[in-house]
């Protein structure tokens, strides 16, 4: 397994609709045709997988139908969007990139993007 550098923003603020987007960029040392991108969430020293997708270079990322993630790829950049976030989902979201094929296999893990999610205040009842 060979190491690869992965860069991602340090902080992102989710929109009021619970959507956060960030770019995950990897320094590809090889000529990979198949890339796997995994988003991991680290909170309270526990790491869980949020979503994952394998894609062919030049093609779109395809996450599972029930995934909260969507994404697009362009060269060595992956634009990731996570939806349906709530305040309790605030945490460090780590981008993991694997160059799956052809060999050699490369693995890169970013430092993580701290995503802050603020639940919107409910609209006060208004009398007309």
């Amino acid at each position: 397994c060979k190491a690869m550098h992965v860069a991602q923003p340090a902080v992102v603020l989710a929109s009021s609709r619970g959507i956060a987007s960030f770019v995950c960029e990897y320094a590809s040392p090889g000529k990979a045709t198949e890339v796997r991108v995994t988003v991991l969430r680290q909170a309270d020293s526990q790491v869980t997988e949020v979503c994952a997708a394998t894609y062919m270079m030049g093609n779109e990322l395809t996450f599972l139908d029930d995934s909260i993630c969507t994404g697009t790829s362009s060269g060595n950049q992956v634009n990731l969007t996570i939806q349906g976030l709530r305040a309790m989902d605030t945490g460090l979201y780590i981008c993991k990139v694997e160059l799956m094929y052809p060999p050699p296999y490369y693995l890169g893990i970013g430092n993580g993007t701290q995503i802050y999610v603020i639940d919107p205040e409910p609209c006060p009842d208004s009398d007309f």
Epitope: Y101, P102, P104
Partner: antibody, heavy 120, light 110 residues
């Protein structure tokens, strides 16, 4: 345990076609790249073709490019080699082989081989 | 066209040590070529001995070892036994999904 069981060999005339199959069991087939390797009578091993675990990436030796097609059906745990425009020099025992682990740096398991004879 | 070279034949005495090599027609073999080694007896499928330069395949005795010696990949067999008499093939990874086998070495134990 890992098993690769091959079928589909036989006698075919020059210019003809043949499809080889390699049925896999004992491992998560879709997680492994696979290759075809052949051996002409009395000769050494020759790598023919490779395919990634998803089936999205394929590679060929120059000697078969444009004539052979590698494919896989992960729902059936089966690897295929479609051989068209066969020539006498394609006569060989054909082996399917699993590429080793996630790093894919070598072949760890082999099928039993199937003989393809191209002759009129 | 890159050619992978091996000694056509080699002989070793029982209990002796033999080193088979795998080179390139032009250039040096390094770990980046992920050399691997296979043993084949007549009429049988190849058996994997070593992959990724020096990793032994499961069930392979530690008499077999892989390394880089100078500008070639090497397979060393220590304490050679009669049933080591076989053909030995190396394969090198050329990048972009392409593998190239050497011509093989016929090892005789006598």
């Amino acid at each position: 345990q890992v098993q690769l069981v091959q079928s589909g060999g036989g006698l075919v005339q020059p210019g003809g076609s043949l499809r080889l199959s390699c049925a896999a069991s004992g491992f998560t087939f879709s997680s492994y790249a696979m290759s075809w390797v052949r051996q002409a009578p009395g000769k050494g091993l020759e790598w023919v073709s490779a395919i990634s675990g998803s089936g999205g990436s394929t590679y060929y030796a120059d000697s078969v490019k444009g004539r052979f097609t590698i494919s896989r059906d992960n729902s059936k745990n089966t690897l295929y080699l479609q051989m068209n425009s066969l020539r006498a020099e394609d006569t060989a025992v054909y082996y399917c082989a699993r590429e080793e682990g996630i790093t894919g740096t070598g072949f760890d398991y082999w099928g039993q081989g199937t003989l393809v004879t191209v002759s009129s | 066209q890159t050619v992978v070279t091996q000694e056509p034949s080699f002989s070793v005495s029982p209990g002796g040590t033999v080193t088979l090599t795998c080179g390139l027609s032009s250039g040096s073999v390094s770990t980046s070529y992920y050399p691997s080694w296979y043993q084949q007896t007549p009429g049988q499928a190849p058996r994997t001995l070593i992959y990724t330069t020096n990793t032994r395949s499961s069930g392979v005795p530690d008499r077999f070892s892989g390394s880089i010696l100078g500008n070639k990949a090497a397979l060393t067999i220590t304490g050679a036994q009669a049933d080591d008499e076989s053909d030995y093939y190396c394969v090198l990874y050329m990048g972009s999904g392409i593998w190239v086998f050497g011509g093989g070495t016929k090892l005789t134990v006598l």
